[in-house]
């Protein structure tokens, strides 16, 4: 029976470890600055890195600019978006800006898109200063189903800070759905 | 066999509980206001509480102003930094401020420092108002190896809000590395 | 013994699954805009949804405007608070605003309230712009005991954005207390 108990312990340890790893999808995606859209209106950001620098993904999929859920669960979602402008980049079309981020969920089964989180600020970036900067952070806990897609929309994408420490979003699974 | 099953269950419950607790390092460090550097340039903040008020640490180490990772894993890192100024504190040298935070990772094996997250804003804190306040929040999910160190850099440290609910940073382990 | 092992495995799987789900309380509460207080002073927000749209709760209780902890543990707490003003809403009493959030913990055993996290900004919302917006995000890792209550206080509640993606707070349990 001792040998049997050891076998049970061993198989259980394997199962626990394996199931724990399988049960915890995550992603941390950083902005791909080579393909940032221009304009000041709200646009969906489709170019993100998933496998270089701080960017990584496991048990989730990145496709067509969207983070796709492969496993039902409750996830913590977050986004950090930085905007900046230096006078050497040229004059702003307007000094009154609306700098916003929207974290949206799209369901393929029911083709609809819903905003999970939003954040931002209106700013007056006057010519009295040569440099302007502003960051937004949002985060929240959401139920996600396999096949659902997370995407990021921002206003004024041409003002985005292209650094990997500045503009990113991510998710990690916290628990199963009952 | 029933007794044996109970023994298996009991030992497993202990093992599961024990391994779960051991597998989840965390820290929440709050600013130690007795030792905030002066100056307006970017500086590393080295004085943090780890065992009073809301501050706490487990299975991580705080040493020389840095949060040291003792256990490989994927961690959620976060920081909340508040800046404030009241006219009774004196005159600002400039009303145009860059209020920033940088969460950095240092690896001892390869002596290099990299910024994981940044946030902040440029601000115009005019003399027309007697009080000014601004907070930054950043958060993200990162792979950390044992021995790596997390530290916080800010600009204008003399403007930091010294309250434990205002200026803090932390980490908690979410999952093992595959 | 094989049958016994299968039984052990089966019972363990049930136990592991059950204990895992039971061990992970969470809540994501969204603002109930039908009952937002007026005024510019700091007030406690007591009307939140817990079971519609993105709002949800499990193994925690929402009562009398407070999120009640039912299970000891270390929790990640977060809040996202959005303020907005459009000129069509009328003139602001003052253009100099202090837009703040305070996440507080109340213990019934020791009737006292303490601020866990705060964030916000002073803003100058001038009449030169027809629309103003600002969001705050805070988050942190805290030890919570059964019976303790989490509540949200804000300044200028009449400026709150009533959307579920804008103004919300939440918590999820990360680990047990040793």
């Amino acid at each position: 029976i001792r040998a049997e108990k050891a076998m049970v312990d061993g198989s259980w340890l394997d199962l626990a470890k394996r199931s724990k790893l399988e049960a915890q999808p995550f992603a941390h995606l950083t902005i791909n600055a080579t393909d940032i859209p221009s304009g000041s209106h709200k646009v969906s950001l489709s170019s993100w890195y998933h496998d270089r620098g701080w960017a990584k993904i496991s048990n989730m999929t990145f496709s067509n600019g969207k983070l796709i859920v492969n496993q039902d669960g409750f996830y913590y979602l977050y986004a950090n978006i930085c905007f900046r402008h230096h006078e050497t980049s040229g004059d702003l079309a307007t000094e009154y800006l609306q700098l916003m981020v929207y974290v949206t969920k799209t369901s393929i089964k029911i083709p609809s898109s819903h905003t999970l989180m939003k954040g931002g600020s209106t700013k007056y970036w006057s010519g009295n200063s040569e440099f302007h900067f502003y960051s937004i952070n949002v985060g929240g806990f959401f139920k996600l189903r396999s096949g659902e897609e997370i995407s990021i929309e921002v206003s004024n994408p041409s003002l985005l800070d292209p650094d990997q420490d500045a503009t990113y979003f991510g998710a990690f699974k916290v628990r199963d759905i009952d | 066999i029933r007794a044996e099953k109970a023994m298996v269950d009991g030992s497993w419950l202990d093992l599961a509980k024990r391994s779960k607790l051991e597998a989840q390092p965390f820290a929440h460090l709050t600013i130690n206001a007795t030792d905030i550097p002066s100056g307006s340039h970017k500086v590393s903040l080295s004085s943090w509480y780890h065992d009073r008020g809301w501050a706490k640490i487990s299975n991580m180490t705080f040493s020389n102003g840095k949060l040291i990772v003792n256990q490989d894993g994927f961690y959620y890192l976060y920081a909340n930094i508040c800046f404030r100024h009241h006219e009774t504190s004196g005159d600002l040298a400039t009303e145009y401020l860059q209020l920033m935070v940088y969460v950095t990772k240092t690896s001892i094996k390869i002596p290099s420092s990299h910024t994981l997250m940044k946030g902040g804003s440029t601000k115009y804190w005019s003399g027309n108002s007697e009080f000014h306040f601004y907070s930054i929040n950043v958060g993200g999910f990162f792979k950390l190896r044992s021995g790596e160190e997390i530290s916080i850099e800010v600009s204008n440290p003399s403007l930091l809000d010294p309250d434990q609910d205002a200026t803090y940073f932390g980490a908690f382990k979410v999952r093992d590395i595959d | 013994i094989r049958a016994e092992k299968a039984m052990v495995d089966g019972s363990w799987l049930d136990l592991a699954k059950r204990s895992k789900l039971e061990a992970q309380p969470f809540a994501h509460l969204t603002i109930n805009a039908t009952d937002i207080p007026s005024g510019s002073h700091k007030v406690s927000l007591s009307s939140w949804y817990h079971d519609r749209g993105w709002a949800k709760i499990s193994n925690m209780t929402f009562s009398n405007g407070k999120l009640i902890v039912n299970q000891d543990g270390f929790y990640y707490l977060y809040a996202n608070i959005c303020f907005r003003h459009h000129e069509t809403s009328g003139d602001l009493a003052t253009e100099y605003l202090q837009l703040m959030v305070y996440v507080t913990k109340t213990s019934i055993k020791i009737p006292s309230s303490h601020t866990l996290m705060k964030g916000g900004s002073t803003k100058y919302w001038s009449g030169n712009s027809e629309f103003h917006f600002y969001s705050i995000n805070v988050g942190g890792f805290f030890k919570l005991r059964s019976g303790e209550e989490i509540s949200i206080e804000v300044s200028n509640p009449s400026l709150l954005d009533p959307d579920q993606d804008a103004t919300y707070f939440g918590a999820f349990k990360v680990r047990d207390i040793d």
Epitope: E130 | S38, S40, G90, D91, A93, T94, E95, Y96 | -
Partner: nanobody
Framework: EVQLVESGGGLVQPGGSLRLSCAAS????????MGWFRQAPGKGREFVGF????????YYADSVKGRFTISRDNAQNPVYLQMNSLRPEDTAVYYC????????????????????WGQGTLVTVSS
């Protein structure tokens, strides 16, 4: 890295005027408070004047008060030192520097309170 470049120096007769400028380049947020200093041949570095980031407040050494004026463009760069009624004792290399503190301290006239020094520009007052 921040770089400061002073210009506008030269030879001028006593009673004459010169306008020095200090331009910042590199990774800078040039709305910082700035100071002007000078170093005469064989002497230590001497405080000349100080201007806040907004330009709203200026301080001067007693030796130049009423003759020198520090200003800055509304749109940040550069910072100017207008020198009138120049005297032979004003002969020196003039430097600009970035004030390192967030608050104006009583020690604003000490060179240790500044960093990112420029290379300097020589002003010679002689007939």
């Amino acid at each position: 890295e921040v770089q400061l470049v002073e210009s506008g120096g030269g030879l001028v007769q006593p009673g004459g005027s010169l306008r020095l400028s200090c331009a910042a380049s590199g990774r800078t947020f040039s709305r910082s408070a700035m100071g002007w200093f000078r170093q005469a041949p064989g002497k230590g570095r001497e405080f000349v004047g100080f201007i806040t980031g907004s330009g709203g407040t200026t301080y001067y050494a007693d030796s130049v008060k009423g003759r020198f004026t520090i200003s800055r463009d509304n749109a940040q760069n550069p910072v100017y030192l207008q020198m009138n009624s120049l005297r032979p004792e004003d002969t020196a290399v003039y430097y600009c520097a970035v004030y390192r503190r967030t608050y104006i301290s009583s020690t604003y006239s000490e060179s240790s309170e500044y960093d990112y020094w420029g290379q300097g520009t020589l002003v010679t007052v002689s007939s």
